[in-house]
């Protein structure tokens, strides 16, 4: 529906609190380096303007698009060129090019200091002194570090963040109450950010059709009792929501997401029996709950898929009449029968089916040609099954830390040109698949593992895209969204790689390692491991294990020493020499 004033429409729909929060998120995701106070000032100006439009939709500038209003506001920032360089050139453009320009300058790895958590008492004081500013700061800090974070979901995180402080700052043991909650929010937040980053990459790099295919498969698994027409409607609406959020249209996105949640709850009888509890919750919780809801039970007596998609004489006619609808029905029917498959596997099967029909429907005897198409699915299904089985066995044998190390070595050998911090971050996340998914029964392992790996490999792809260094990474990231994981799995040791020059400084450690958390200490060791592999890509597992065991013993010994720094200096030199000898450097 056309509204005289879009900004007034969204302000009224969302309410002032959500409006302000979403504008702050939008601005922080665009101008990631701007100080908090500058953003708050811009948000307040936009909010005041929106209120004038609510009072009189015909007032000056109220008819302008949100992109125009927000872009004009961002372009008033005085230090734009000094802080952002060429991003300032966006301001010379007209909409919609200006917004596209801002989007292209979003930085997945902004040069921002790590968020250090203050003492609990300090945080509680800040929370009590000015709750509103405290929560705005949370939105700002998360949004600028995660420029694709799903904005309506960030509102949900902020609500939980507020609830944690409200409860725990009154508790007898504030820290015991608060810290686990903050850890949980941090971990969930990182996961949520990464999942949304994949959705945006899917839309932006592979187009709406790719995203819709993903959504058909996932929603069909989740809502197997829903009719195809119902799933198609949900997919269309969900695609609109995510297209808006990934495009920076956060007000529209949040508004449309609320409408979608409302529709789902009003029609839950024809969608899923699992929605009842979700639909009793307030809006933000409701939307989150629906997004995470468990798969409904499959309908009994689902007929064979082969009847309509292989045995029918009308396959080519149906395909020719409406290719995407027919393939969508195939994907829907296959996915609702296979909650045990990953979404990416289902998409590979649909792609194989499509390729077969393209070839066979032009053949002399189409039916004879496509009659065995389902046989082609077998190896595609078995490949991830076998891979997950092997890796879960390895995880159970090694435990998470050593499993991560095995992956660090594996991936560094595949793509040694990638920066060490990226290899460490990505391999650590890949390694988390073990504790996340291997505990599940067979029927849940593949969807858990392979779809999680898609999210993690997308992190590698977006980080690599910023500064491309490996043709192999570029190839795996850009050729096919659904074949990224098999593409990386298939990579062998890069024989063209020239080993990195040995630099003793890389392997020089100091007493500060002793005060690090267990996680930070692991990262230090894993960084060293990646560097070792980069120096000696042909090193065997045994050689690397020996060096890493020596390294762990060295850190433990020096952290127990009276004069830690001297120990690190002297024992460190010995360790480097011994390691060089062991690896033949």
């Amino acid at each position: 529906d056309a509204h005289k004033s879009e900004v007034a429409h969204r302000f009224k729909d969302l309410g002032e609190e959500n409006f302000k929060a979403l504008v702050l998120i939008a601005f922080a995701q665009y101008l990631q380096q701007c100080p908090f106070e500058d953003h708050v000032k811009l948000v307040n100006e936009v909010t005041e303007f929106a209120k004038t439009c609510v009072a009189d939709e015909s007032a000056e500038n109220c008819d302008k698009s949100l992109h125009t209003l927000f872009g004009d506001k961002l372009c008033t920032v005085a230090t734009l060129r000094e802080t952002y360089g060429e991003m300032a050139d966006c301001c010379a453009k007209q909409e919609p090019e200006r917004n596209e320009c801002f989007l292209q300058h979003k930085d997945d790895n902004p040069n921002l200091p790590r968020l250090v958590r203050p003492e609990v008492d300090v945080m509680c004081t800040a929370f009590h002194d000015n709750e509103e500013t405290f929560l705005k700061k949370y939105l700002y800090e998360i949004a600028r570090r995660h420029p694709y974070f799903y904005a309506p979901e960030l509102l949900f995180f902020a609500k939980r963040y507020k609830a944690a402080f409200t409860e725990c700052c009154q508790a007898a043991d504030k820290a015991a109450c608060l810290l686990p909650k903050l850890d949980e929010l941090r971990d969930e937040g990182k996961a949520s950010s990464a999942k949304q980053r994949l959705k945006c990459a899917s839309l932006q790099k592979f187009g709406e059709r790719a995203f819709k295919a993903w959504a058909v498969a996932r929603l069909s698994q989740r809502f197997p009792k829903a009719e195809f027409a119902e799933v198609s409607k949900l997919v269309t609406d969900l695609t609109k929501v995510h297209t808006e959020c990934c495009h920076g249209d956060l007000l529209e996105c949040a508004d449309d997401r609320a409408d979608l949640a409302k529709y789902i709850c009003e029609n839950q009888d024809s969608i899923s029996s699992k929605l009842k509890e979700c639909c009793e919750k307030p809006l933000l919780e409701k939307s989150h709950c629906i997004a995470e809801v468990e798969n409904d039970e499959m309908p009994a007596d689902l007929p064979s898929l082969a009847a309509d998609f292989v045995e029918s004489k009308d396959v080519c006619k149906n395909y020719a009449e409406a290719k995407d609808v027919f393939l969508g029905m195939f994907l829907y029917e296959y996915a609702r029968r296979h909650p045990d498959y990953s979404v990416v596997l289902l998409l590979r099967l649909a792609k194989t089916y499509e390729t077969t029909l393209e070839k066979c429907c032009a053949a002399a005897d189409p039916h004879e040609c496509y009659a065995k198409v389902f046989d082609e699915f077998k190896p595609l299904v078995e490949e991830p099954q076998n891979l997950i089985k092997q890796n879960c066995e390895l995880f159970e044998q090694l435990g998470e830390y050593k499993f991560q190390n095995a992956l660090l070595v594996r991936y560094t050998k595949k793509v040694p040109q990638v920066s060490t911090p990226t290899l460490v971050e990505v391999s650590r996340n890949l390694g988390k698949v073990g504790s996340k998914c291997c505990k599940h029964p067979e029927a849940k392992r593949m969807p858990c593992a392979e779809d999680y790996l898609s999210v993690v490999l997308n992190q590698l792809c977006v980080l690599h895209e910023k500064t491309p260094v490996s043709d192999r990474v570029t190839k795996c990231c850009t050729e096919s969204l659904v074949n990224r994981r098999p593409c990386f799995s298939a990579l062998e040791v890069d024989e063209t790689y020239v080993p990195k020059e040995f630099n003793a400084e890389t392997f020089t450690f100091h007493a500060d390692i002793c005060t690090l958390s267990e996680k930070e200490r692991q990262i230090k060791k894993q960084t060293a491991l990646v560097e070792l592999v980069k120096h000696k890509p042909k090193a065997t597992k045994e050689q690397l294990k020996a060096v890493m065991d020596d390294f762990a013993a060295f850190v433990e010994k020096c952290c127990k020493a009276d004069d830690k720094e001297t120990c690190f200096a002297e024992e460190g030199k010995k360790l480097v020499a011994a390691s060089q000898a062991a690896l033949g450097l």
Partner: antibody
């Protein structure tokens, strides 16, 4: 007992609409393609269309646009929605189960007894 | 698509061998997607033969079908009293929209 029972027939004025039902018992309606066939008094059998196990519908060219086949798996019932009815649509309407699942083979091995539709003013 | 049955009516006696033919204006699907039905007054049709020559479940072996492409035959080797009825052929074609019935052959007692 495996059977099909049609209902919903009757007298209707030209231009009117009617929805016929076909209740299946003893088997799942969605396990085979299900079709509708009609027979005017003392005339030939005439194929109307079919719905496949996956819900694809196929209609005789003359029926396309006016007639719609659907089913409700939860009720194990097949439907024929008929719009803009004419005098020449007067016939006994049969629902039938095809040997195939995904298309019409023309081999209907289970039939209902039929329901009479009369279109007249 | 036209299905032409001949003859349109036929008289015969118990014990006779009877042949009914069906011709389609186009080849049926796979050259064999043709069925034969028997219908008695006030009853729905009953499937006798499918895929041109396969006997439907519970149908006596005196009924047989043959043919391919556009020309098909239903044979009753030795007429029984209960066989006097109208016989229809039906063809399946390359599209499910094109399924068609013949207009029947009425078999009566001579």
């Amino acid at each position: 007992e495996v059977q099909l029972v049609e209902s919903g027939g009757g007298r209707v004025q030209p231009g009117g609409s009617l929805r016929l039902s076909c209740a299946a018992s003893g088997f799942s309606l969605s396990s085979n393609a299900m079709g509708w066939v009609r027979q005017a008094p003392g005339k030939c059998l005439e194929y109307i269309g079919i719905i496949s196990v996956g819900g694809f519908t196929y209609y005789a060219s003359w029926a396309k646009g006016r007639f719609t086949i659907s089913r409700d798996n939860s009720k194990n019932t097949l439907y024929l929605q008929m719009n803009s009815l004419r005098a020449e649509d007067t016939a006994t309407y049969f629902c039938a189960r095809d040997r195939h699942g995904g298309d019409s083979s023309g081999a209907f091995y289970l039939w209902g007894q039929g329901t009479q539709v009369t279109v007249s003013s | 698509i036209q299905m032409t049955q001949s003859p349109s009516s036929l008289s015969a006696s118990v014990g006779d061998r009877v042949t009914i033919t069906c011709r389609s204006s186009e080849s049926v699907y796979s050259n064999n997607q043709l069925s034969w039905y028997q219908q008695k007054p006030g009853q729905p049709p009953k499937l006798l033969i499918y895929d041109a020559s396969d006997l439907a479940s519970g149908v006596p072996s005196r009924f047989s079908g043959s043919g391919s492409g556009t020309d098909f035959t239903l044979t009753i080797s030795s007429l029984q009293p209960e066989d006097f009825a109208t016989y229809y052929c039906a063809g399946g074609f390359s599209s499910s929209s094109d399924t068609a019935f013949g207009c029947g052959t009425k078999l009566t007692v001579l």
